[in-house]
Amino acid sequence: RQQWELQGDRRCQSQLERANLRPCEQHLMQKIQRDEDSYGRDPYSPSQDPYSPSQDPDRRDPYSPSPYDRRGAGSSQHQERCCNELNEFENNQRCMCEALQQIMENQSDRLQGRQQEQQFKRELRNLPQQCGLRAPQRCDLEVESGGRDRY
């Protein structure tokens, strides 16, 4: 591997060790639980394609008002702290991807079923954009083996 790649990996590792990604995890868990409560069910029921254009975070206008703006104070506080942490990764997209992977891995045991996992993954992919940052475009968030088509 090229020297700069190895240096980048080491820099990312230390960045990840310094980062506190817990607010991001809390914010996302509150978000998907609140969505389920407000709909009275999983909003991404099997009858809907979770990768349909209207639900694909890559298709959402990143400059439309944040869907989190109207949320409770606790969540917005978590979001603000989360965004501050993610901001540290802005100039290293690959490392931001690793941060998102870490969030996914940390929460995977708490996600109930495939649908909730997919919803969490969608919200997680969209999280950097909600913070006004570019989302990593080539990022695996699979906890288990096997991929999903993205776009």
Partner: antibody, heavy 120, light 107 residues
Framework: EVQLLESGGGLVQPGGSLRLSCAAS????????MSWVRQTPGEGLQWVSA????????YYADSVKGRFTISRDNSKNLLFLQMNSLRAGDTAIYYC?????????????WGQGTRVTVSS | DIQMTQSPSSLSASVGDRVTITCRAS??????LHWYQQKPGKAPNLLIY???TLQSGVPSRFSGSGSGTDFSLTISSLRPEDFAIYYC?????????FGQGTKVDIK
């Protein structure tokens, strides 16, 4: 020296299939996302499909979704594009392209291209 | 999808001329804007990435600038080998999209 060598292009009838391959060398293939980009005289350059370095997550342009499948074999440094239900509009030169390590959204090396012609 | 619009679509210039090509994105893309050069019968070749960073091996007469939605590629003093087609590309969001190209030919 980075090298990408495409193969598998040719003449095929509408509705037919082709499988393109791209042999990579000169870099750590398993560290990089890879893409297929095509070029037609009318449409210019169009990104077609990509996948992450592990191959777990795939991405497609709307125009090929459901018809094309991208895959890779990291043990052999190979990238593939399986093209089914081909249409006249798929006629193009297909390039295999290496994406930058840091996921900044550019193609730092390209193959020489393989020509695909869909015609009856 | 993010639309990329290049101008002009073609231009005629002489060796030694200063040439500027512009590229506009349909929405803000920060500095995720990249430039390629393509010669007849060849694959595109990366010139500039992240709006202004020169790819290794590319002559310093090429430069790029801009951020947000408006970008430009400048060749400070055109050389015979620079006559080609130039493309911009956004890498901010899937699907990555290209401009329609600017053909630079000999006056």
């Amino acid at each position: 020296e980075v090298q990408l060598l495409e193969s598998g292009g040719g003449l095929v009838q509408p509705g037919g299939s082709l499988r393109l391959s791209c042999a990579a060398s000169g870099f750590t293939f398993s560290n990089h996302a890879m893409s297929w980009v095509r070029q037609t005289p009318g449409e210019g350059l169009q990104w077609v499909s990509a996948l992450t370095y592990s191959g777990k997550t795939t991405y497609y342009a709307d125009s090929v979704k459901g018809r094309f499948t991208i895959s890779r074999d990291n043990s052999k440094n190979l990238l593939f594009l399986q093209m089914n239900s081909l249409r006249a509009g798929d006629t193009a030169i297909y390039y295999c392209a290496k994406e930058d390590y840091d996921d900044r959204g550019f193609f730092d090396f390209w193959g020489q291209g393989t020509r695909v012609t869909v015609s009856s | 999808d993010i639309q990329m619009t290049q101008s002009p679509s073609s231009l005629s210039a002489s060796v030694g001329d200063r040439v500027t090509i512009t590229c506009r994105a349909s929405q803000t893309i920060s500095t995720y804007l990249h430039w390629y050069q393509q010669k007849p019968g060849k694959a595109p070749n990366l010139l500039i990435y992240a709006a202004s960073t020169l790819q290794s091996g590319v002559p310093s007469r090429f430069s790029g600038s801009g951020s947000g939605t408006d970008f430009s590629l400048t060749i400070s003093s055109l050389r015979p080998e620079d006559f080609a087609i130039y493309y911009c590309q956004q890498g901010y969001n899937n699907p990555y999209t290209f401009g329609q190209g600017t053909k630079v030919d000999i006056k």
